[in-house]
């Protein structure tokens, strides 16, 4: 999902420590920035979220909230500290004017501001049909574990509590952050200020139409009677649940928050502190038609981030807009006419549709996984969610056309068994944002923290690139994708698994002065060849084909055109076995793929000879996807054959491990 | 499958009481709310009671509150009908029925139930 | 209470004809409405809940449509096997309450 670059505006506003009455001046030379939606309409100026350097206390927070209040009253401002932060980001939130920004700016701790803006809801039977394996019966669906040791929050609307579909299953919590309705003769109606999150609810562990019939819910509203909320109201409903998890720690917990807004900082901030802190955070991915990495929580790379589709595992519709897209989201669910509970009457039921009611589906999923197997972190989950999804039915021609390369085409399913899916190894490709058309522009694609990146590739449209490598950044490897001079942008692909126990390391051969090509392998014992990239310094490497069959018993080798270095992902992890398998055509052809079969993981995908008619690699589920440009202004010379290759690999040691338990 | 099964009726004199149950399988039955709806030969169909999940919560059709008592024992996946007081006018074709929707989803083949002297 | 009333006791129609049943209620119940098939000598079918929702396996010929006082059930095309009463329910308060009941039959 998103990495540092998200399309939001950035007023970087350099300190001097000139302001009277700084005890504490920042150090020479550091810069706190200032944020703000870039959704013109959705901006709140007037009130601010003040975020403080990681390590702040909370004294140090009130300390710093007092001395802005105190300057700024020096030059006749009034301001009002609204609430101070912690527990989950240290900082404060306050509300003056914009005038007083470059003061606040300089106060020490001071990290970064953003500007408060609106977040919104999310929405307008076949569903556990969808996501039930065929084994179950839709009619009369029974989950195999109904979520009963997971408690959900849910940050939203008011709710029905005394729903028949919900009672005895949602605890209404005393948390309300919620702006005034916009409008002068807004009627407050109970049943339509709980139309969004009472249907959630229920979507979520309604006796009926829910997913994880067991679960439990906390709800916090955050979303008034017009479904509209604030960044900073969401942030405190996080912070809530952050302390009741620090007061009270129970089992696992799952937050939904079916709600978007522009891209924010501060909100991804505060998602990646929870997650961190062992919560699982399921978002919709925004019901714009339009990039999720545009849109906050969506574009926070800790959450689970969920798309729409319909009965027919299309995209889902929404009069002129529809789903959310792009590599921001995780994977889809059922998201248009979804039954549940409607606040009309405490026996209604209604259906709405949207990437809320998608992502109400996904943390019912989430709940019921967790049930089964209470320890599951994060990433585990995230990964078991992708594994058990319904592959490759989506119809991408209703996404952009430049966007399709980039979503996953998964639709959220349960798990045959919610047990016993250990032995998997289990890996997911993540893509890095765009890096833009400059000559030295790079991408970076990341893993989760838990997450061992086991190859990188890179692709891009206009075929001009000058490779990939994996490189330390932050005691993690991450994926580096290069541009090349005259090119639109490339993306960096990584390849990120759960490898429990595992050492891997990075093996470079630097561009070979022989005409055989470059070479690189695994020459420590033990360790094993899970991933080839290669990054070269010209900006086209011309023809060059190097052999493409290994020599025999070489199998943990990585070969590649002379003028480039070549590196080789070699890992060390218990019972790790690894092998190669490629598939070449003479004849040139725009996509040539190879796949793992049943029982082995693809953990790399890369492509033979790394010549620049190649856009690139890149892993869509077990099949290895290496493109070139198109047939017609490639001729049909040697040029245009193009070998696919597949790193698969499985774990004996999980599998043992897993026959062991059962 | 989802199967529910009433007890025998019968022919029963006016001013006594009659115990009706149904046996409920194929499914999770403490998850459902269950009813009770009669008819009367070659009339329409009359709600009588339904019973929450658990027990707790019970809701009569007004004219039978004081003489009908729904219950259940959802350890044994039984739903009861305790009729008292029974009047001429009761004499009617007895249903279980599941509720799911808050709609009657799944019925049972019905119990003729003769109040007569 | 509730009262339920469908104003026609008897629909006569043919084999492929459309046919629509009215139900009215005496208060607004929102879409809380369920219809229900019944034929001699069996129990009672549940076909739509919720005004429009067609229950599982009910075939497509089937809708329901409406919301708070007036609604109706259509069957877009009569075959044999569709003759029978059919029953409006509300389920908006207890008591729930049901129509009189519209037999439908042959002309």
């Known amino acids: 999902q998103e990495d540092e670059d998200g399309d939001y505006e950035e007023l970087v506003l350099a300190l001097r420590s000139e302001e009277d009455g700084l005890a504490e001046a920042p150090e020479h030379g550091t810069t706190a920035t200032f944020h703000r939606c870039a959704k013109d309409p959705w901006r709140l100026p007037g009130t601010y979220v003040v975020v403080l350097k990681e390590e702040t206390h909370l004294s140090q927070s009130e300390r710093t909230a007092r001395r802005l209040q105190a300057q700024a009253a020096r030059r006749g401002y009034l301001t009002k500290i609204l609430h101070v932060f912690h527990g989950l980001l240290p900082g404060f939130l306050v509300k003056m004017s914009g005038d007083l920004l470059e003061l606040a700016l300089k106060l020490p701790h001071v990290d970064y501001i953003e500007e408060d803006s609106s977040v919104f809801a999310q929405s307008i039977p076949w569903n556990l049909e969808r996501i039930t394996p065929p084994r179950y019966r839709a009619d009369e669906y029974q989950p195999p574990d109904g979520g009963s040791l997971v408690e959900v929050y849910l940050l939203d609307t008011s709710i029905q509590s005394d729903h028949r579909e919900i009672e005895g299953r949602v605890m209404v919590t005393d948390f309300e952050n919620v702006p005034e309705e916009d409008g002068t003769r807004f009627h407050r109606q109970a049943s339509k200020c709980d139309s969004h999150g009472t249907h959630l609810a229920g979507v979520v562990s309604g006796r009926d139409a829910g997913v994880a019939k067991g679960a439990s819910m906390r709800s916090l509203r955050v979303l008034n009677c017009q479904g509209k909320g604030t960044v900073s109201g969401t942030l405190i409903g996080l912070e809530f649940i952050r302390k009741s998890q620090l007061v009270q720690p129970v089992g696992p917990l799952v937050v939904l928050l079916p709600l978007a807004g522009g891209y924010s900082r501060v909100l991804n901030a505060a998602c990646q502190r929870l997650a961190r802190a062992g919560v699982v955070l399921v978002t919709a991915a925004g019901n714009f038609r339009d990039d999720a990495c545009l849109y906050s929580p969506a574009s926070a790379p800790e959450v689970i981030t969920v798309g729409a589709t319909n009965a027919q595992d299309q995209p889902v519709t929404l009069g002129t807009l529809g789903t959310n897209f792009g590599r921001c989201v995780d994977l889809f669910a059922p998201g248009e006419d979804i039954i549940g509970a409607s606040s009309d009457c405490s026996t209604c039921f209604v259906s709405q549709s949207g990437t809320s009611q998608a992502a109400a589906h996904v943390a019912g999923i989430a709940a019921m996984m967790l049930s089964a197997e209470p320890e599951l972190t994060l990433a585990e989950l995230r990964q078991r969610l992708i594994h058990f999804s319904a592959k490759d039915v989506i119809n991408e021609a209703w996404f952009p056309e430049d966007q399709r390369v980039l979503t996953p085409n998964l639709v959220a399913a349960l798990p045959p068994s919610t047990h016993g899916a250990g032995w998997q190894l289990f890996c997911r490709t993540v893509w890095s944002a765009h890096s833009g058309p400059t000559r030295m522009a790079t991408a970076v694609a990341r893993c989760a923290p838990d997450e061992e990146l086991l190859s990188c590739s890179s692709f891009s449209r206009s075929g001009k690139r000058r490779g990939e490598r994996m490189e330390a950044q932050g005691g993690k490897l991450v994926c580096r994708a290069h541009n090349a001079f005259g090119g639109e942008g490339v993306y960096a692909i990584a390849r990120c698994c759960l490898l429990p126990q595992a050492n891997c390391s990075v093996h470079t051969a630097p561009p070979a002065e022989a005409s055989m090509g470059t070479r690189v392998h695994c020459h420590q014992q033990g360790h094993v060849l899970t991933g080839c990239s290669s990054h070269w310094e010209v900006e086209d490497l011309g023809t060059h084909k190097p052999p493409v069959l290994r020599p025999r018993g070489q199998p943990n080798q990585c070969v590649g055109h002379r003028e480039a270095s070549i590196h080789a992902s070699c890992c060390h992890a218990p019972g790790l076995e690894c092998k190669v398998k490629e598939h070449g055509i003479p004849a040139p052809q725009e996509q040539v793929t190879v796949a793992c079969e049943e029982g082995w993981t693809l953990t790399g995908c890369s492509a033979l000879p790394g010549t620049s008619h190649v856009l690139g690699a890149y892993a869509v589920d077990n099949t290895c996807v290496v493109r070139s440009r198109d047939v017609s202004t490639t001729g049909s010379t040697s040029e245009g054959a193009v070998t696919a290759v597949a790193i698969c690999c499985r774990s004996r040691h999980l599998a043992q491990a897993s026959q062991e338990l059962q | 499958e989802v199967k529910l099964v009433e007890s025998e009726g019968g022919l029963v004199q006016p001013g006594s009481s009659m115990k009706l149950s149904c046996t409920a399988s194929?499914?999770?039955?403490?998850?459902?709310?269950m009813a009770w709806v009669r008819q009367v030969p070659e009339k329409g169909l009359e709600w009588v009671a339904n019973i929450n999940y658990d027990g707790s919560n019970t809701s009569y059709l007004d004219s039978l509150k004081s003489r009908f008592i729904i219950s259940r024992d959802n350890a044994k996946n039984i739903l009861y009908l305790q009729m008292s007081s029974l009047k001429s006018e009761d004499t009617a074709t007895y249903y279980c029925?599941?509720?799911?929707?808050?709609?009657?989803?799944?019925w049972g083949q019905g119990t003729s139930v003769t109040v007569s002297s | 209470d509730i009262v339920m009333t469908q104003s026609h006791k008897f629909m006569s129609t043919s084999f492929g004809d459309r046919v629509s049943i009215t139900c009215k209620a005496s208060q607004d119940v929102s879409n809380a409405l369920a219809w229900y098939q019944q034929k001699p000598g069996h129990s009672p079918k549940l076909l739509i809940f919720s005004a429009s929702y067609r229950y599982t396996g009910v075939p497509d010929r089937f809708t329901g449509s409406g919301s708070g006082t007036d609604f109706t059930f259509t069957i877009s095309s009569v075959q044999a096997e569709d003759l029978a009463v059919y029953y409006c329910q509300q389920h908006y308060s207890t008591p729930w309450t049901f129509g009189g009941g519209t037999k439908l039959e042959i002309k």
């Open positions: 029925a599941r509720e799911k929707f808050a709609a009657m989803d799944y």
């Open positions: 194929g499914f999770t039955f403490s998850d459902y709310y």
